[in-house]
């Protein structure tokens, strides 16, 4: 969930050095605060569509609204894998795609969105109320997951509006890198604000909104912001409230919600481990574990249509030295 600050409208102060300085010290913190609360958190959207031609055929589309590079996308159904869900497809920007039945065709649509077509026959075919989840592992944000399903009354051929991200998991990796800089910025901002309290404020024209801590409001991506991100199908229905962790009632709703706390702590040796280890410079990490891919230049990159490659969180590992111990 992203939040944005409503910045109070400031009238220009009276001319003069003190006025100019006061203007600068007031505007800078508010700009910083706006950046602080809007730039930090990515979103995931999910769209589920039942095909009109084949009643038990589904198309799932997922996208990531974030600035980081995507390392992996996992699509599951029946909830997140590890919390009662079953993996349907895993997509890696360089290494390719792995699918499980009844997945028929998974592919990259853009660098930040994927689609998956599900076969609709046999015991493993999906039903109309199935929950589909997409998890994006991204650097530096960490892992972000959202789920969606067809509304009970859906007509074939109609799609459920993409759901704004119920963010089920944000690894500690999100605190690193850019987020770390933001955190520092926010601390610095608070310091500025505290200092500003003890200074005579410049005279302002009366305003309805007093320059106190701004109210934050829930943010759903606007059409304009999505267009800027070039993410297709991301027409967010802002009328629907994003599901959050407070929907995790043990006795109500889909059964997998009750397992969310377990799922949130599901990968203890994942990015959280970075917090206690030195973080190498981006692209400098070389592991000799993947001895299989030692012959440089032999491994063709797996790319989807129009997909350009972007770096893995831990640097280039596709072609490395002979097998050895890290």
């Amino acid at each position: 969930m992203r939040t944005e600050a409503q910045v109070p409208a400031l009238q220009p102060p009276e001319p003069g050095l003190e006025g100019a300085m006061g203007h600068r010290t007031l505007v800078l913190p508010w700009v910083l605060l706006t950046l602080c609360v809007t730039a930090g958190t990515p979103e995931v959207w999910v769209q589920v569509r039942m095909e009109a031609t084949e009643l038990s055929s589904f198309t799932i589309r997922c996208g990531f609204l974030g600035s980081g590079s995507i390392s992996l996308v996992t699509v599951s159904w029946g909830g997140p894998n590890g919390a009662g869900g079953t993996t349907l497809a895993v997509l890696h920007p360089e290494r390719g795609i792995r699918q499980w039945a009844p997945a028929r065709q998974a592919r990259w649509e853009t660098q930040s969105s994927i689609s998956l077509i599900l076969e609709g026959s046999g015991a493993s075919s999906p039903c109309a109320n199935t929950t589909f989840c997409c998890k994006f592992a991204s650097f530096p944000e960490g892992s972000w997951e959202a789920c969606g399903s067809l509304p009970p009354s859906s007509d074939p051929g109609l799609s459920a509006p993409p759901t704004p991200a119920p963010i089920l998991r944000a690894d500690l990796a999100g605190i690193l890198g850019v987020s770390g800089v933001l955190l520092f910025g926010c601390v610095y901002l608070l310091h500025l604000l505290r200092r500003h309290k003890h200074r005579p404020a410049p005279r302002l024209q009366p305003s309805r909104t007093s320059p106190q801590a701004p109210r934050a409001r829930a943010w759903a991506p606007s059409q304009a912001s999505q267009a800027a991100l070039h993410v297709p199908y991301a027409t967010i229905n802002t009328s629907c409230r994003p599901a959050t962790l407070d929907t995790a009632h043990p006795h109500g709703g889909p059964s997998w919600w009750a397992s969310l706390p377990t799922h949130a702590a599901h990968r203890p040796q994942g990015p959280a481990a970075w917090a206690s280890t030195p973080i190498p410079a981006r692209g400098s990490f070389v592991s000799v574990e993947n001895g299989l891919y030692a012959q440089a230049g032999e491994r063709p990159p797996h790319t989807g249509p129009g997909l350009t490659l972007f770096p893995d969180p831990r640097g280039p590992r596709a072609m490395e030295g002979p097998l050895g111990v890290r």
Epitope: S71, L72, T74, N81, G82, T87, V90, H92, R95, G96, I97, R98, Q99, W100, A101, A103, A137, A173, H266, R267, P268, Q269, G270, P271, A273, S287, E289, N290, G291, L292, Y293, R299, P300, P313, R314, R317, L323, V325, R326
Partner: antibody, heavy 126, light 107 residues
């Protein structure tokens, strides 16, 4: 030395249970998906089960689902396969195999197997 | 589940000859196919991954080709140690499945 060593095989009656172990050494065990692959006498290879690196997500072949349980102990660098309700058709050499791709974060696995143990024979017979 | 059919079941050749092994998938597996070599009493050994890429330490005489449903493993000039059983494996649609194997024997 990079290696996998299976143990725990033997003769068991139909309906019985057996627990196989696979000790890994010489590599970062927690960063690899690990699988069990079996081979019936004189037959081809059949993938049985897999478990992801640190997340512990599990996968099973339909033929063993509900009867076999895969697990791992990353602190001991050991992979396990608990086999219950054994049938004659489960008779095979069971190999422990390492996924070719090392990934301790995102969870990707290639599902190609670049390191295999020597295998342990499981015989189900009355 | 994707079925892999290997042919021929047995290939009788002499050292120095060229061996061509085939693997056909029941549906497209893109290029997500591997080849393994297995000698009697030993575990399988990964030779080729992603249809055409040699694994570490595999001699250049081994090469793989193909995509979609038809794949070929070629051994350009057979060495005495190459006589073994060869399996193909697909990983496009999981669970991974193996072909029935091709035995390359000395003529």
């Amino acid at each position: 030395e990079v290696q996998l060593l299976e143990s725990g095989g033997g003769l068991v009656q139909p309906g019985g249970s057996l627990r196989l172990s696979c000790a890994a050494s010489g590599f970062t065990f927690s960063g690899h998906l690990m699988s069990w692959v079996r081979q019936a006498p004189g037959k081809g290879l059949e993938w049985v089960s897999a478990i992801s690196g640190s997340a512990g997500e599990t996968y099973y072949a339909d033929s063993v689902k509900g009867r076999f349980t895969i697990s791992r102990d990353n602190s001991k660098n050991t992979l396990y396969l608990q086999m219950n309700s054994l049938r004659a058709e489960d008779t095979a050499v069971y190999y422990c195999a390492r996924d070719a791709y090392y990934d301790d974060w995102s969870g990707w696995a290639d599902w190609y197997f670049d390191l295999w143990g020597r295998g342990t024979l499981v015989t189900v017979s009355s | 589940e994707i079925v892999l059919t290997q042919s021929p079941a047995t290939l009788s050749l002499s050292p120095g000859e060229r061996a061509t092994l085939s693997c056909r998938a029941s549906q497209s597996v893109s290029r997500y196919l591997a080849w393994y070599q297995q000698k009697p009493g030993q575990a399988p050994r990964l030779l080729i991954y992603d249809a055409s890429n040699r694994a570490t330490g595999i001699p250049a005489r081994f090469s793989g080709s193909g995509s979609g449903t038809d794949f070929t493993l070629t051994i350009s000039s057979l060495e005495p140690e190459d006589f073994a059983v060869y399996y193909c494996q697909q990983v496009s649609l999981l669970p991974p499945t193996f072909g029935g194997g091709t035995k390359v024997e000395i003529k």
